[in-house]
């Protein structure tokens, strides 16, 4: 019977998760006489196969990061190998799984900030990339300051934009940072995928050295 997994030759789209070992057929095309066999062309990457009787399947796990869409064509042939139907487009959309971890572009970053700089004004960006689909949580990155060294009176002088990786001073940092007292700081920063919201997220860590410079501007005397 015709149904979800079998039917006549017509344009179709299938969605398959990457990384899954092939476990079932994709589709069984039915031949209409005089068609007796089927032929597959296009971006098969030696993964997609169609048997003469019209059984379309794949023989190994897909990788979205290699190819996110496979554009295939299926044609029906007669006994002489002449195309009698098609070719019709068959689109395989490869769905993303979280199989890549975010990676910082640098293992160590260096930056400087002037004391009394405006809170929230970025003076340095850390940047990570993730090969997974940014339109899914798998590729949505979440930046976080793990620790500030030194921690003085348990006050955070620096903050990070969780989405962009922009580092800036907190209100306390703007008011209290003083290069005469402590000219250098270090931040340990992590990035997590899954928007930072999952136990199953992948992560990476980087180190940021920050030099605090003196604010040479002096308020004019009255």
């Amino acid at each position: 019977q015709e149904g979800k997994f079998s039917g006549p030759l017509k344009p179709m789209t299938f969605s398959i998760y990457e990384g899954q070992e092939p476990s079932q057929i994709i589709f069984q095309f039915k031949a209409n006489p005089p068609a007796v066999t089927f032929e597959l062309t296009g971006e098969t990457d030696n993964i997609f196969v169609i048997e003469r009787e019209g059984l379309l399947y794949y023989n190994r796990a897909l990788d979205r990061e290699t190819r996110s869409t496979h554009n295939l064509q299926v044609a029906a042939l007669d006994a002489n190998g002449i195309i009698v139907e098609g070719p019709v487009p068959i689109t395989i959309k490869v769905k993303d799984i979280n199989d890549n971890r975010p990676t910082f572009l640098q293992s160590k970053y260096e930056g400087s900030v002037r004391q009394n700089s405006r809170p929230g004004k970025p003076f340095l960006y850390v940047n990570a990339t993730d090969l997974d689909d940014p339109a899914t949580p798998n590729g949505q990155l979440y930046y976080q300051i793990v620790i500030q060294l030194p921690m003085i009176n348990n006050v955070m002088y620096f903050q990070i934009n969780n989405k962009t990786g922009a580092i800036s001073l907190t209100r306390e940092g703007s008011q209290e940072l003083n290069p005469a007292k402590n000219p250098s700081y270090n931040l340990v920063i992590s990035v997590k995928d899954m928007g930072g919201q999952s136990e199953n997220s992948f992560s990476d860590t980087t180190s940021v050295d920050i030099i605090v410079t003196e604010n040479i501007w002096k308020a004019p005397k009255p």
């Epitope: 793990v146 060294l149 030194p150 270090n186 340990v188 180190s207």
Partner: antibody, heavy 122, light 107 residues
Framework: EVQLQQSGPELVKPGASIKISCKAS????????LNWVKQSHGKNLEWIGL????????SYNQKFKGKATLTVDKSSSTAYMELLSLTSEDSAVYYC???????????????WGQGTSVTVSS | DIVMTQSPATLSVTPGDRVSLSCRAS??????LHWYQQKSHESPRLLIK???QSMSGIPSRFSGSGSGSDFILSINSVEPEDVGMYYC?????????FGGGTKLEIK
């Protein structure tokens, strides 16, 4: 005097999970990061990860993702490491170690616990 | 990951000898290199931080040098209580990594 007191030895069966503790004293617990280090066969040292008791922030060696989970209880100045789905490869001595809080001495571990021996055997 | 390689694996010395233990990083780590001593059945102990800064309470015979990717821990007159394992640690970038260790023994 700074001290890191770890929980006692563990003998567990494969597949089990355990939680080992590291109780800090003699300093401001929230002011310093705590690291966990694995020592196999009395030799190789491997950094598992760190936790900042101040905000609970963690950083893991990806080799130990899914194997170790780090937490803290600020009220008791205690750090914990849960080791999941243990196998014979996880048999080792596990140390907690405090970071020197000075940014000039990047990530040096200045105080260490006495270690917790974990043996995984059926 | 930064790979830390220590040599030699074992060093047999006579008390009073001056010895050098080598640690090499697979890439430049500036001076972010720390040395630890571990005696038998004890926890590691920080000896030298940031390449050459001695920890308080560490005997003056221990010194560290080097920058970039090559580092040396020197003991200028070995004493019997110095036997044990010596490890270097990358303090430059994550994941933090340790060398495989040098075993110091007395002949």
């Amino acid at each position: 005097e700074v001290q890191l007191q770890q929980s006692g030895p563990e003998l567990v069966k494969p597949g089990a999970s355990i939680k080992i503790s590291c109780k800090a004293s003699g300093y401001s617990f929230t002011g310093y990061a705590l690291n966990w280090v694995k020592q196999s066969h009395g030799k190789n040292l491997e950094w598992i990860g760190l936790i900042n008791p101040y905000n609970g922030g963690t950083s893991y060696n990806q080799k130990f993702k899914g194997k170790a989970t780090l937490t803290v209880d600020k009220s008791s100045s205690t750090a914990y490491m849960e080791l999941l789905s243990l196998t014979s490869e996880d048999s080792a001595v596990y140390y907690c170690a405090r970071w020197d809080g000075n940014p000039h001495y990047y990530y040096a571990m200045d105080y260490w616990g006495q270690g917790t021996s974990v043996t995984v055997s059926s | 990951d930064i790979v830390m390689t220590q040599s030699p694996a074992t060093l047999s010395v006579t008390p009073g000898d001056r010895v050098s233990l080598s640690c090499r990083a697979s890439q430049s780590i500036s001076d972010y290199l720390h040395w630890y001593q571990q005696k038998s059945h004890e926890s590691p102990r920080l000896l030298i931080k940031s390449g050459s800064q001695s920890m308080s309470g560490i005997p003056s015979r221990f010194s560290g040098s080097g920058s970039g990717s090559d580092f040396i821990l020197s003991i200028n007159s070995v004493e019997p209580e110095d036997v044990g394992m010596y490890y270097c640690q990358n303090g430059h970038s994550f994941p933090l990594t340790f060398g495989g260790g040098t075993k110091l023994e007395i002949k």
